[in-house]
Interface confidence: low
């Protein structure tokens, strides 16, 4: 700035203000004096001449500097704007990240809750399954107990099948019919024991003229032994008749036991055919002779287990054992209570 100030001062001196050129003298003193003055003059004029070009250059330089500065400034502004934009974007991203984090936390907690609910429901289902299985077992047990009770109740009963019906029938008439059967088929039994009957009746109790076959007669003895003696005697005799016509004597069993006995049918027939001397014993046990011993079987599964170690027997009973068993625990039918 100082330099500029001097120049401006020099610039203010005009030509009219400068003295006219002096004559040159040859004396050293005057020569010196002339030289100094002349030098001053030259400096002044030279300054004036060089001053404008220098200034012009200076202004041009400064202009370029300003231009450069402006460009730098613009660049800076652009950079600031970009930075601001980036910052804004970063802030938005940060907000989004926070929101996503919150959403994730929320979803996570919801998933946790759903998991809780699912596991609670699974627990409930397992509990229900357990209860269901337990209930099924209980029902099975109850049905078995009921079957056993019925069989126990019916133990002293004898069932007479195929005895013709007459128009007027009462207890006494049926009792006489039984005495006739005993006399005709088991005279020894009639002599041996006093046949004591607790009750005797047709079943079902209601008579229907539409029935093709006579209703069964249920005889309830006071003692089980009497019933068993009669059954044994009937087995030994092979053919039981009434007035010459064939009739059948069987134990009076519960519907379930009858079903269980029926299920032994195919197996029984095969064993009978092959001379294994099968028998169905009370209430529904299958027995037959194998390896010189009498073997007893409560159900098909027990027999299955037995034949696994006996290939010949397994082959023999293969089909009969694989046949799908009817539901053993059917709804209980009405039993004739005796």
């Amino acid at each position: 700035m100082g330099k500029k100030q001097n120049r401006k001062t020099g610039n203010s001196k005009t030509q009219s203000a400068s003295p006219p050129p002096k004559e040159r003298s040859s004396s050293p003193a005057t020569e010196q004096s002339w030289m100094e003055n002349d030098f001053d003059e030259l400096r002044e004029e030279g300054f004036r001449r060089s001053n404008y070009s220098e200034l012009r250059e200076d202004i041009q330089t400064k202009g370029k500097e300003v231009e450069n500065f402006e460009k730098n400034l613009e660049e800076c502004i652009t950079r600031i704007t970009n930075t601001e934009k980036c910052l804004k974007e970063l802030m938005e991203l940060k907000t989004k990240a926070r929101e996503l984090r919150e959403e994730c936390r929320s979803l996570r907690s919801r998933c946790d809750q759903l998991e809780e609910r699912v596991s609670a429901m699974e627990d409930e289902m397992n509990e229900m399954k357990r209860e269901g299985k337990f209930r099924e077992k209980r029902i099975k047990r109850n049905e078995q107990s009921l079957q056993e009770i019925w069989d126990y109740v019916k133990r002293p009963n004898l069932r007479l099948i195929g005895v013709p019906e007459s128009d007027v029938e009462n207890g006494t008439k049926l009792e006489n019919t039984l005495q006739d059967i005993i006399q005709e088929n088991f005279p020894n039994l009639a002599r041996q024991a006093n046949v004591q009957i607790q009750e005797i009746q047709r079943t079902p109790q209601r008579y229907s003229s539409r029935r093709a076959t006579p209703r069964h007669i249920i005889v309830r003895f006071t003692k089980v032994e009497m019933k068993e003696k009669m059954l044994r005697a009937a087995r030994e005799k092979g053919r039981v008749t009434l007035k010459g016509k064939p009739i059948r004597l069987t134990a009076d069993l519960s519907a379930e036991t009858l079903q269980a006995r029926r299920e032994w049918g195919p197996i029984f027939n095969i064993l009978k055919e092959k001379n294994f001397q099968p028998r169905i014993s009370y209430p529904a046990k299958l027995s037959f002779i194998s390896e010189g011993e009498i073997k007893y079987f409560i159900d098909k599964q027990m027999l299955r287990d037995f034949v696994t170690t006996r290939p010949a027997l397994k082959e023999l009973l293969k089909e009969a054992l694989n046949m799908e068993r009817n539901n053993r625990y059917q709804p209980l039918q009405n039993h004739a209570k005796m």
Partner: nanobody, 123 residues
Framework: QVQLVESGGDLVQAGGSLRLSCAVS????????MGWFRQAPGKEREFVSS????????LYSDSVKGRFTISRDNAKNTVDLQMNSLKPEDTAVYYC?????????????????WGQGTQVTVS
């Protein structure tokens, strides 16, 4: 569209109890986080309590903590607010709210659905 209907608002003496109930219709309540807000005359609406979808997480404002209990019955589509040891400063209109995305730090803006409100006055 989910609709919320509050009931149970009443005039009660200080120290007394009140049970507010909110019935949710037009949607399954178990799909929503539920909450209660209140607004006293001349004051901002403020958060009272909220409960998560399954009811496993609950939140209470400091002013009601220990006195109010929030519960829900998803089978009946209801949310209840049991208010005990009521104070005069509990006097306000109580609003039932529902939110799709339950947050552990609920703000008023988060809640998507609002009921009409029920007046509770503690004298």
């Amino acid at each position: 569209q989910v609709q919320l209907v509050e009931s149970g608002g009443d005039l009660v003496q200080a120290g007394g109890s009140l049970r507010l109930s909110c019935a949710v219709s037009g949607g399954t309540s178990s799909n929503y986080g539920m909450g209660w807000f209140r607004q006293a005359p001349g004051k901002e609406r403020e958060f009272v309590s909220s409960i998560s979808w399954s009811g496993s997480r609950t939140l209470y404002s400091d002013s009601v903590k220990g006195r109010f209990t929030i519960s829900r019955d998803n089978a009946k589509n209801t949310v209840d607010l049991q208010m005990n040891s009521l104070k005069p400063e509990d006097t306000a209109v109580y609003y039932c709210t529902a939110v799709r995305e339950y947050r552990d730090y609920p703000q008023r803006d988060n809640f998507d659905y609002w009921g009409q409100g029920t007046q509770v006055t503690v004298s």
